[in-house]
């Protein structure tokens, strides 16, 4: 049976410190992220470099439980957050209808056997709409890297322009158009945006006791995934061996 897992992590992910000493695995998270008030955001962690079996993933906001994804039983969303938290994609969590009060630390806690517990940290800042649109002071690492790349390219452009003034207009037009296309393409892959259609990971083995309604689902786009998932039901947690 095929199990689809829409993974949102990419090159911008950060490694988080482990909860205890002798474990080999690492937790990668979406790091520091920002989102617009009223919007939604996907919190995603990924456990790699270990063959330990993931038995459960807990999501916490500061000291409050948001959700549990249990290998045997599926998802449990805390009633306190039921209206604004949706499970998935995968072992991640989607926060909806964000408010400024949602700003803060979020933790993914991976319970594994035999390693024990791994914890990842994500810091979310929810910005007022205007700030989110115009301010770039608090961007995820991927966008930071993108900005650095733009600076380098722009510098190169300026040098080229200085050397060959007569081709100035043509070159600037060409490069800027190309950069806009690159930028748009990169944003689709940012950790706070859905994976492109078709980017599925097939689980190595389906957990034995899952009770979700999604068992027979083929891989779908993110919006389809949420349309079919009754998010307070015991939807499947696509547990699989997460080795990197």
């Amino acid at each position: 049976m095929r199990w689809c897992l829409l993974l949102i992590w990419a090159q911008g992910l950060r490694q988080a410190p482990l909860a205890s000493g002798m474990m080999t695995g690492t937790i990668e998270t979406t790091g520091n992220i920002s989102a617009e008030k009223g919007g939604s955001i996907i919190l995603q962690c990924h456990l790699s470099s270990t063959t330990a079996q993931v038995t459960q993933v807990n999501w916490e906001q500061q000291d409050q439980l948001l959700a549990i994804c249990n290998a045997d039983l599926g998802w449990h969303i805390s009633p306190s957050f039921k209206d604004r938290v949706a499970p998935g994609p995968g072992l991640g969590l989607t926060l909806q209808s964000l408010t400024v009060n949602d700003t803060g630390e979020y933790f993914c806690i991976y319970h594994t056997y035999p390693d024990g517990t791994y914890t990842g940290r994500i810091f979310l800042e929810v910005l007022e709409s205007s700030v989110a649109e115009h301010g770039a002071r608090f961007q995820i690492p991927l966008l930071g890297a993108m900005a650095a790349t733009l600076v380098v390219i722009c510098t190169a452009v300026i040098v080229v322009v200085a050397l060959t003034r007569k081709k100035k207009a043509l070159r600037i037009h060409s490069v800027e158009g190309d950069l806009r296309r690159k930028s748009a393409g990169q944003e689709e892959w940012s950790p706070s945006a859905p994976s492109p259609p078709g980017s599925c990971v097939q689980a190595e083995a389906a957990p034995a006791g899952l009770c979700g309604e999604q068992r027979g689902e083929d891989c779908a786009e993110l919006h389809d995934y949420f349309n079919v998932l009754s998010y307070r039901s015991l939807g499947n947690c696509s547990f699989f061996t997460e080795t990197g």
């Epitope: 459960q56 807990n58 439980l65 549990i68 249990n70 045997d72 039983l73 599926g74 998802w75 449990h76 009633p79 306190s80 039921k82 806690i109 319970h111 009770c211 307070r232 039901s233 015991l234």
Partner: antibody
Framework: QVQLQQSGAELVRPGTSVKMSCKAA????????IGWVKQRPGHGLEWIGD????????NYNEKFKGKATLTADTSSSTAYMYLSSLTSEDSAIYYC?????????????WGQGTSVTVSS | DIQMTQSPSSLSASLGERVSLTCRAS??????LSWLQQKPDGTIKRLIY???TLGSGVPKRFSGSRSGSDYSLTISSLESEDFADYYC?????????FGAGTKLELK
């Protein structure tokens, strides 16, 4: 099969405290929430709170904060409820029930109840 | 807190009769309602969950339904072991709350 075995009846003095237990069998104790419910004649059923042994998370009904404390011992698959500063209002039957999620496992199995009588 | 208004508070019926109990939620509970049966010895059993799904091992004469904020438990043909107390429970929001109960007695 799933069983929740509660401790025996208690007769206690006002102002004292009591600790009752709910021993789980037939399932993975750490996977399910254990909720506690109070029943007094003429007052129906009241939800006190719940605990998730797989993470130590607890939720309390505001009405019982400061009165009830929920704990769990995973090594013995037992959940406990501690009631403090007992008064006659605390005389009741207390039930434990297991739960997880909102469908199949929602409050699906119940203990037989522990009777607490507060009397001088 | 969400109030669950259960009716009737008591009901006398005969063997083989069809009976219905109702609970009304003061707020939206999204169908997250269970029906519980409590026998005279105090034993509690869940009959229905998610408003209309029959619990494991529960006889098919029990059924649950929903109409807006009204939730019903129907017993299609009463048997002797059905005479007991019945409670609805909403588990949509903390604190979970119960109806006041219906005492089903043999006429």
């Amino acid at each position: 099969q799933v069983q929740l075995q509660q401790s025996g009846a208690e007769l206690v003095r006002p102002g004292t405290s009591v600790k009752m237990s709910c021993k789980a069998a037939g399932y993975t104790f750490t996977n399910h929430w254990i909720g506690w419910v109070k029943q007094r004649p003429g007052h129906g059923l009241e939800w006190i709170g719940d605990i998730y042994p797989g993470g130590g998370y607890t939720n309390y009904n505001e009405k019982f904060k400061g009165k009830a404390t929920l704990t769990a011992d995973t090594s013995s698959s037992t959940a406990y409820m501690y009631l403090s500063s007992l008064t006659s209002e605390d005389s009741a039957i207390y039930y434990c029930a297991r739960s997880y999620g909102y469908d199949l496992y929602a409050m699906d199995y119940w203990g037989q109840g522990t009777s607490v009588t507060v009397s001088s | 807190d969400i109030q669950m208004t259960q009716s009737p508070s008591s009901l006398s019926a005969s063997l083989g009769e069809r009976v219905s109990l109702t609970c009304r939620a003061s707020q939206e509970i999204s169908g997250y309602l269970s029906w519980l049966q409590q026998k005279p010895d105090g034993t509690i059993k869940r009959l229905i969950y998610a408003a209309s799904t029959l619990g494991s091992g529960v006889p098919k004469r029990f059924s649950g339904s929903r109409s807006g904020s009204d939730y019903s438990l129907t017993i299609s043909s009463l048997e002797s072991e059905d005479f007991a107390d019945y409670y609805c429970l909403q588990y949509d929001s903390y604190p979970f709350t119960f109806g006041a109960g219906t005492k089903l007695e043999l006429k």
